[in-house]
């Protein structure tokens, strides 16, 4: 891909003197890795993001870039440093031959190198030419707070900021980083160039068809007139936002990324850094009718990833494709025939569809929530978005069978009141990636930094698994699931909750020798049981053991198969109380569920007994689901009896704090 000026004249031939005294060897014992987009047509060979190790200073980045140029020049290669990153990720963007990758990977401070790739606007059609006025009465929707304390950054195409729907609401920054349009005869028509961004700005904050009518926006141009951008341009845009935030700290920031490209380690890393700096990022899941985890920034765990549904709450079909799905999607939102500002004229409206429109809805809702409660953290905001969503309204048959259990059945909704949800104990379910089928394969599910892991479960479609356990990793608990010999792989399922001032620990009992089964309880004063896990080393837990029933009056105890080690998650937090709720079915059943009552939140979900015909247990909203192998293969013996065990908690402390505020 050529420079904007169309040639390589400006490429630097670095001077030999530049490399005097510089060793070529990388830092001892580290190997930098090379990454590129899995989707070949989206690759942009010749431009590379060189990511340096976390603590690298700007001066070191510049020195490393100069060293690369010098060493390349010595080999007769031209290179051009296009940008030096700092503030978000240390590193630099370089235009060079792929022949130099081996050399670049050996440079000191280099963590990894990623080939640049394309990202795309996620709306279809680009412009329908269908101009329509807003189709509802304006007074039907008058939100209590229009998001006036929040700034929403939009990384998109250029926009028509003086459109009647958004005039005065959008500040067009001077940031622009876009690739040349494809095709020699491409005609830049202003209204087409502005189409995508103008529509989304209208969906977020438009006067008449916007979600957060009071939100102010800032736009950065990272997509060209064809709706195409680059990972590197998006990275530089995110860095621009971070620098703006440092120079002039304002109130809460929401960043809307209505674009998608192939999986990108560096784009995900940049999103993580920005999120950890207190910025809320919302992105489109993608319009590829595919697993969102294969795309970026949709696959970044710190980003709120939004799929698209229609007016009937069904997943949106877009031509032969449609909304993405899977465990990387946080929730869905309206994304079909969404009316918003059209750049065709200053008073025009147009209908567009896609996960971009869905993400814009959620960005608007987020702006309103943050305006009402500016101190909300990203974790708190995400939990609230999930909590207030419409549950179980999407027809899951649209999704591929193996993705149904992983895809959240949630459609974003505005909270009935933007205040007063503080007393709730919020929890969400986080699925790991699939472990893969090897005998010792494991899968790990993690909670966000300010969430507590309150329980851990596992699931395998083949039923061949060796359970799960909670373990410490980098000072935080994670949920690890274990595959078994002959298994097709497992998922780990973490129950991640907001529990301020919590002190949680895991108590483990090794496999019992006696036939009564293994049991473990929370013995520390003031600690309550929030979840039970079991893990076993044997390939197949005995299926003919009688099911173990919990002795009455033992609410703080986990019980399990005598050949399994049992893990109890025990937590102490102000006012936290929990209870165990069980639902057992004597006859074999493919699915057994138990739900927590109103006012209580599901923190733990497990199955009794943990025998091999149980595929696993997982939480769906406030319901514990235990899945077993097909009844026809199990027969109706006693081994088919399964009990779903839910642990339901609430926090009296949060309730009291909320009442004091009101």
């Amino acid at each position: 891909q050529e420079d904007e000026d169309g040639d390589y004249e400006e490429l630097v031939l670095a001077l030999r003197s530049e490399e005097d005294g510089l060793a070529e060897a990388p830092e001892h014992g580290t190997t930098a890795t090379f990454h590129r987009c899995a989707k070949d047509p989206w690759r942009l060979p010749g431009t590379y993001v060189v990511v340096l190790k976390e603590e690298t200073h700007l001066s070191q980045s510049e020195r490393t870039a100069r060293r690369l140029q010098a060493q390349a020049a010595r080999r007769g290669y031209l290179t051009k440093i296009l940008h030096v990153f700092h503030g978000l990720l240390p590193g630099f963007l370089v235009k060079m031959s792929g022949d130099l990758l081996e050399l670049a990977l050996k440079l000191p401070h280099v963590d990894y190198i990623e080939e640049d790739s394309s990202v795309f606007a996620q709306s279809i059609p680009w412009n329908l030419e269908r101009i329509t006025p807003p189709r509802y009465r304006a007074d039907e929707y008058q939100p209590p707070d229009g998001g006036s304390l929040v700034e929403v950054y939009l990384l998109d195409t250029s926009i028509q900021s003086d459109h009647r729907e958004i005039e005065g609401r959008v500040m067009v920054t001077d940031f622009e980083n876009v690739p040349e349009e494809d095709g020699t005869r491409f005609h830049r028509q202003a209204s087409k160039c502005d189409s995508h961004g103008t529509h989304l700005a209208g969906v977020v904050s438009g006067r008449d068809a916007g979600v957060a009518k009071g939100a102010s926006m800032r736009s950065l141009r990272v997509l060209n007139c064809q709706g195409k951008g680059t990972v590197s341009g998006t990275l530089i845009g995110l860095e621009f936002i971070r620098k703006s935030q440092l120079v002039q700290p304002v109130g809460p920031l929401v960043v809307l990324l209505p674009l998608a490209g192939g999986y990108s380690r560096v784009l995900n890393a940049a999103c993580q850094r920005l999120a950890r700096a207190g910025v809320v990022l919302v992105t489109a899941a993608g319009n590829f009718r595919d697993d969102a985890c294969l795309y970026s920034p949709a696959s970044a765990p710190e980003v709120i990833t939004v799929g698209a549904t229609n007016a009937q709450d069904q997943p949106v079909t877009l031509g032969t494709l449609g909304t993405n799905f899977g465990r990387c999607v946080d929730l869905f939102a309206p994304g079909e025939d969404i009316i918003g500002a059209s750049s065709d004229c200053s008073t025009c409206f147009v209908s567009q569809s896609g996960t971009s429109q869905a993400a814009a809805h959620v960005a608007g809702i987020a702006a309103m929530m943050l305006s009402a409660e500016p101190e909300l953290t990203l974790a708190e905001l995400r939990q609230r978005l999930i909590h207030f969503s419409a549950k179980d309204v999407i027809n899951e048959a649209w999704f591929p069978e193996d993705q149904r259990v992983l895809t959240p059945n949630l459609v974003a909704a505005l909270p009935p009141s933007t205040h007063g949800a503080g007393w709730q104990l919020f929890c969400r379910t986080v699925w790991s990636a699939h472990s893969g089928p090897t005998r010792m394969a494991t899968a790990v599910a993690r909670c966000a930094p300010d969430e507590e892991l309150l329980s851990c479960s596992s699931f395998s479609r083949s039923g061949k698994r060796r359970g799960e356990r909670m373990e410490a990793q980098g000072g935080k608990l994670v949920c690890r699931a274990h595959n078994a010999f002959g298994g097709e792989g497992v998922y780990a399922i973490a129950r991640c909750c907001l529990l301020p001032q919590a002190n949680c620990s895991v108590h483990t009992a090794p496999p019992a020798e006696a036939s009564m089964g293994t049991r473990v309880h929370c013995h520390q004063q003031g600690h309550v049981l929030t979840g039970c896990s079991s893990h076993w080393e044997v390939e197949d837990l005995g299926t003919h053991k009688p099911p173990v029933l919990r002795p009455r009056g033992q609410p703080n105890q986990c019980v399990g198969h005598r050949e399994a080690s049992i893990h109890a998650s025990c937590c102490h937090a102000p006012g936290l109380e929990c209870k165990v709720k069980e639902h057992g079915i004597p006859a074999p059943q493919e699915q057994v569920t138990v739900a927590c009552e109103e006012g209580w939140t599901l923190t733990g979900c497990s199955a009794l007994p943990g025998t091999s015909h149980v595929l696993g247990a997982y939480a769906v909203d406030n319901t514990c689901v235990v899945r077993s192998r097909d009844v026809s293969t199990t027969g109706s013996t006693s081994e088919g009896a399964v009990t779903a065990v839910a642990i339901c908690c609430r926090s009296r402390h949060l309730a009291q704090a909320s009442q004091e505020l009101q």
């Epitope: 006025p133 807003p134 009465r137 304006a138 007074d139 008058q142 028509q160 900021s161 003086d162 009647r164 005039e167 005065g168 959008v170 500040m171 067009v172 202003a190 006067r207 008449d208 009518k213 004229c345 200053s346 008073t347």
Partner: antibody, heavy 115, light 109 residues
Framework: QVQLVQSGAEVKRPGASVKVSCKAS????????ISWVRQAPGQGLEWMGW????????NYAQKVQGRVTMTTDTSTSTVYMELRSLSSDDTAVYYC????????WGQGTTVTVSS | QSALTQPASVSGSPGQSITISCTGT?????????VSWYQQHPGKPPKLMIY???NRPSGVSIRFSGSKSGNTASLTISGLQAEDEADYFC?????????FGGGTKLTVL
């Protein structure tokens, strides 16, 4: 501060044309268009149209369509409104205002059409 | 003939509250959130007092408030003061343009 400064009063003969200017300052010009509104003596306000400073697009009121032309000169941050084929009915104070929201107004330009 | 209908005049004594109505149709006032109110003193340009139905620009007294029900918008001025005596105009978006009311002369007795 945000300001719109208009050109001075004009006296025109019927059938002639008038061109009124409006110089904007104190804000990001491309974030707002400019509306033109007129007020005949002792009468109410009448919206004449709007022009985009961003791309020059216009939106004219039906009543004056064909007789009015709005233009911009971004180098001087000035917007112009030209009205042709003047008649005594066009005698009015002509205002420019910021955007469709019309939150800031020029001081007004009196145009008198008299034979 | 103005598209939006306002009473020609209203009056009130200092300290009282008055309300000026602005009636349109579902194609203007009823269909959009963008109803504005302007105050105009003789020989001066109009001044924006309320925008988007009920929002007050900075610098405008809290005595001025706006509301809307169906196709009718209202401007209420509480604690009437002598300097409030002026002409008041409402405006609204239509699908492609803007319309004003005929104006209401407020007299402070």
């Amino acid at each position: 501060q945000v300001q719109l400064v208009q050109s001075g009063a004009e006296v025109k003969r019927p059938g002639a044309s008038v061109k009124v200017s409006c110089k904007a300052s104190g804000y990001t010009l491309t974030s707002y268009g400019i509306s033109w509104v007129r007020q005949a003596p002792g009468q109410g306000l009448e919206w004449m149209g709007w022009i985009s400073v961003y791309n020059g697009n216009t939106n004219y009121a039906q009543k004056v369509q064909g007789r009015v032309t709005m233009t911009t000169d971004t180098s001087t941050s000035t917007v112009y409104m030209e009205l042709r084929s003047l008649s005594s009915d066009d005698t009015a104070v002509y205002y420019c205002a910021r955007g469709y929201g019309m939150d800031v107004w020029g001081q007004g330009t009196t145009v008198t059409v008299s034979s | 003939q103005s598209a939006l209908t306002q009473p020609a005049s209203v009056s009130g004594s200092p300290g009282q509250s008055i309300t000026i109505s602005c009636t349109g149709t579902s194609s203007d006032v009823g269909g959009y959130n963008s109803v504005s109110w302007y105050q105009q003193h003789p020989g001066k340009p109009p001044k924006l007092m309320i925008y988007e139905v009920s929002n007050r620009p900075s610098g405008v007294s809290i005595r001025f408030s706006g509301s809307k029900s169906g196709n009718t918008a209202s401007l209420t001025i509480s604690g009437l003061q002598a300097e409030d005596e002026a002409d008041y105009f409402c405006s609204s978006y239509t699908s492609t343009s803007m319309v004003f009311g005929g104006g209401t002369k407020l007299t402070v007795l």
